[in-house]
Interface confidence: low
């Protein structure tokens, strides 16, 4: 009996708070050997499958789902899962995509103070939190 597949992770570039009309890329990551990633909306009413899977690192594969111009209809909760060797993984955590008009006049371009940030988002400033590794992916609010 094979063990359970590792849970995928989900993140957004350049962040989870995006002004309308701007692009965002939702990134799903899983182990090497994934055949297909699925990006789902919260109620599973909409999903997007892709077999365009690339190797993000020696131990990780990823798929990137780009939205060229976000609108209010794109806001909401997203999660990933994947197929490997005909088996479906568990779902990732939810990512909350916020579509918010900022006119650039904000101090925190990535996340609001209570938002979580994915692994490719800005970490805390090293000089103010020396124990936070660069890959930890803390909320960008620590910096901006």
């Amino acid at each position: 009996q094979e063990g359970p597949l590792p849970r995928p992770s989900i993140s957004a570039e350049p962040g989870t708070v995006i002004p309308p009309g701007r692009p965002v890329t939702i990134v799903c990551r899983g182990p090497v050997g994934v055949d297909q990633f699925r990006l789902e909306r919260e109620d599973r009413s909409k999903f997007n499958d892709t077999k365009d899977v690339s190797q993000a690192s020696p131990s990780e594969s990823e798929a990137r789902f780009r939205i060229d111009s976000v609108s209010e209809g794109n806001a909401g909760h997203y999660r990933c899962l994947y197929v490997k060797s005909t088996r479906w993984s568990e779902h990732s955590d939810y990512l909350d995509l916020v579509v918010k008009e900022t006119s650039g006049d904000t101090d925190s371009p990535v996340t609001e103070p209570d938002s979580s940030a994915g692994p490719t988002q800005r970490p805390s400033d090293n000089s103010h939190n020396e124990h936070a590794p660069a890959s930890q992916g803390l909320s960008a609010e620590h910096l901006y």
């Epitope: 490719t120 400033d125 890959s135 609010e141």
Partner: antibody, heavy 119, light 107 residues
Framework: EVQLVETGGGLVQPKGSLKLSCAAS????????MNWVRQAPGKGLEWVAR??????????FYADSVKDRFTISRDDSQSMLYLQMNNLKTDDTAMYYC??????????WGQGTPVTVSA | DIQMTQSPASQSASLGESVTITCLAS??????LGWYRQKPGKSPQLLIY???SLADGVPSRFSGSGSGTKFSFKISSLQAEDFVIYYC?????????FGSGTKLEIK
């Protein structure tokens, strides 16, 4: 129209002090983080300092090369940004730009004010 | 600190040609990368933000690509005003470091 106008540059002796000012207009100053970036003659760009907003306790960040010598500050009531430069070195000779970001990127730059540190 | 290695330092090209500049980050920065142009005696101008997004008012002949540690910046169909200096910058963590610049020269 966004405008950033730097003043206060000039000639100063090593170990001297200088205070740069940046008058901002055309946008809501008090909800923007602001930066100073410099460029030595014939050289590349170097980020110097950053100050966040009141909501973020006016947190400040500095390049290692200016830490403990330069102080960034702001006056939201006047839409002004400042850079107090103490114990100046010849290496600090540069054009100093006031910069406002948009979505974290340096989208608006002033025209710059020159600082020369020389005996 | 994150080092940004920009190449080439200079490049010669002809009007109408395409050129590509690359920037390598010493650690992953997601898409927190900007590209700037600086004309002689002028302030820098933001061209590309978030690695791939065109800044307001910037012509579509400019484009950016990449994520993580490797980024590219392309100018297609070079025009006379494009022969200036270009910089990349990471905005992932302080200090917010720039590349050393690429001087584009007319052939």
């Amino acid at each position: 129209e966004v405008q950033l106008v730097e003043t206060g540059g000039g000639l100063v002796q090593p170990k001297g002090s200088l205070k740069l000012s940046c008058a901002a207009s055309g946008f809501t100053f008090n909800i923007n983080a602001m930066n100073w970036v410099r460029q030595a003659p014939g050289k590349g760009l170097e980020w110097v300092a950053r100050i966040r907003t009141k909501n973020n306790n006016y947190a400040t960040f500095y390049a290692d090369s200016v830490k403990d010598r330069f102080t960034i500050s702001r006056d939201d009531s006047q839409s002004m940004l400042y850079l107090q430069m103490n114990n100046l070195k010849t290496d600090d000779t540069a054009m100093y730009y006031c910069v406002r970001d948009r979505a974290g990127f340096f989208a608006y730059w002033g025209q710059g004010t020159p600082v020369t540190v020389s005996a | 600190d994150i080092q940004m290695t920009q190449s080439p330092a200079s490049q010669s090209a002809s009007l109408g040609e395409s050129v590509t500049i690359t920037c390598l980050a010493s650690q992953t920065i997601g898409t927190w990368l900007g590209w700037y142009r600086q004309k002689p005696g002028k302030s820098p101008q933001l061209l590309i933000y978030a690695a791939t997004s065109l800044a307001d008012g910037v012509p579509s002949r400019f484009s950016g690509s990449g994520s993580g540690t490797k980024f590219s910046f392309k100018i297609s169909s070079l025009q006379a005003e494009d022969f200036v200096i270009y910089y990349c910058q990471q905005l992932y963590s302080t200090p917010l470091t720039f590349g050393s610049g690429t001087k584009l020269e007319i052939k």
